[in-house]
């Protein structure tokens, strides 16, 4: 038996740094969708009511408690009749997979904020990305949310060669040894080693010494 006409399918959570959107199929014809998400009291909260989109931004709900495991469902209604129901007296609906933001949100591509050379040492700083998670009316950074669960890996190499070295840190800073007179290039990756899925971000854009971001001091 196929999916009944109008019923949503392929419900998928798309989440990066806690910005979280539920997507589904198909594009509606003669019907609309309404999304519900279960809150921490296990009540269903209505979102994106009567939409003809096939996505719904649920960020403002999931950031209330990023450690909570959420479930959503997409309800289908004939166009212009939000009261219309299926044969069992309920609207057609499809449940999403469960989603735990802290464990599953993708780590966004990090950015190298700066690097500074002092003699044969280079200090590399990773930008502490702001998330949409709030506490006490302020937005928390990625580090604020993940704490020591989040590490960064630095890949660095001489501009004149391809041999990469790595360093890791539990903060947003690295301090690496370099050869004097050599230019180096850098890229960083965010990692949550304790995760089973979505453990690593994509690599940051490469930054090289001799370009804008760096500073050199004898």
């Amino acid at each position: 038996a196929g999916t009944p006409p109008g019923k949503a399918f392929n419900l998928t959570w798309i989440s990066t740094d806690f910005k979280t959107i539920l997507e589904w199929q198909p594009k509606p014809t003669n019907y609309t969708y309404t999304v519900q998400i279960s809150d921490r009291s296990r009540n269903w909260k209505y979102k994106c009511t009567g939409t003809t989109d096939t996505e719904c931004d649920l960020t403002d709900e999931i950031v209330k408690d990023v450690n909570w495991t959420y479930e959503a469902r997409v309800l289908s209604y004939p166009a212009g009749n939000v009261e219309s129901t299926g044969s069992a007296g309920e609207p057609l609906y499809e449940n999403s997979p469960e989603f735990t933001p802290y464990l599953e949100t993708n780590l966004g591509q990090p950015t190298i904020q700066s690097f500074e050379q002092v003699g044969t040492k280079v200090n590399v700083t990773v930008e502490d990305e702001r998330t949409l998670v709030r506490r006490n009316n302020t937005f928390l950074s990625l580090r604020d949310v993940f704490g020591k669960d989040l590490i960064y890996t630095l890949y660095y190499w001489k501009s004149s060669s391809s041999g990469k070295k790595t360093a890791k840190t539990n903060t947003n800073e690295f301090l690496i040894d370099v050869d004097k007179g050599e230019n180096y290039c850098f890229s960083v990756q965010a990692v949550i080693p304790s995760r089973t899925v979505n453990r690593k971000s994509t690599d940051s854009p490469v930054e090289c010494m001799g370009q804008e971001k760096g500073e050199f001091r004898e």
Partner: antibody, heavy 125, light 108 residues
Amino acid sequence: QVQLQESGPGLVKPSQTLSLTCTVSGGSISSGQYWSWIRQHPGKGLEWIGEIYYSGSTRYNPSLKSRVTISVDTSKNQFSLKLSSVTAADTAVYYCARDAPYYYGGGYYYYMDVWGKGTTVTVSS
Amino acid sequence: EIVLTQSPGTLSLSPGERATLSCRASESVDSSYLAWYQQKPGQAPRLLIYGASTRQTGIPDRFSGSGSGTDFTLTISRLEPEDFAVYYCQQAGVVPYTFGGGTKVEIK
């Protein structure tokens, strides 16, 4: 120089909640360190209970997680431990500690470098 | 959890002698997260070594740490009277952070 001081009742009845506070002096609790609780049963080794960042991000020992809450009050420069449903097995010296970043191998890693003197908590009726 | 086993449980030595303390992990530990602490009776532990081999500021150079993977060692090259205490290794890379059971270095 950062100093830590634990405070709280030395005697707690079984099934009640143990509550301790650690006051940080000589530095800000919001300055990028983590703040930990560790305990030591009489004549025994050390057991890590959990830690908190100034933002409220926590990590707990799974063996105690269902009973432990660690919180932070940045306005008072304090962090606190609550351990519920205590039994005699929770009798121990409780230490608070600072987890600060140290340079190693190209990066920075956290180690417990400043400890309070410890406070003895006895669970007994 | 990672279990750290320290041996021997007690080490009886005289001042001036060399002390070698062992810490063995049940699974591989990243050296970046391995520390050694000293604890004297009635006192809180004190950080001696971090990153398996780096001395904390103010720690005398008679203390040295080494090792990687599952086997780590703390060496006190010449015991001073103030070194008689209990020593703990600790890993802080995997939750729960764990301590070894301790080695007591006592005066012979």
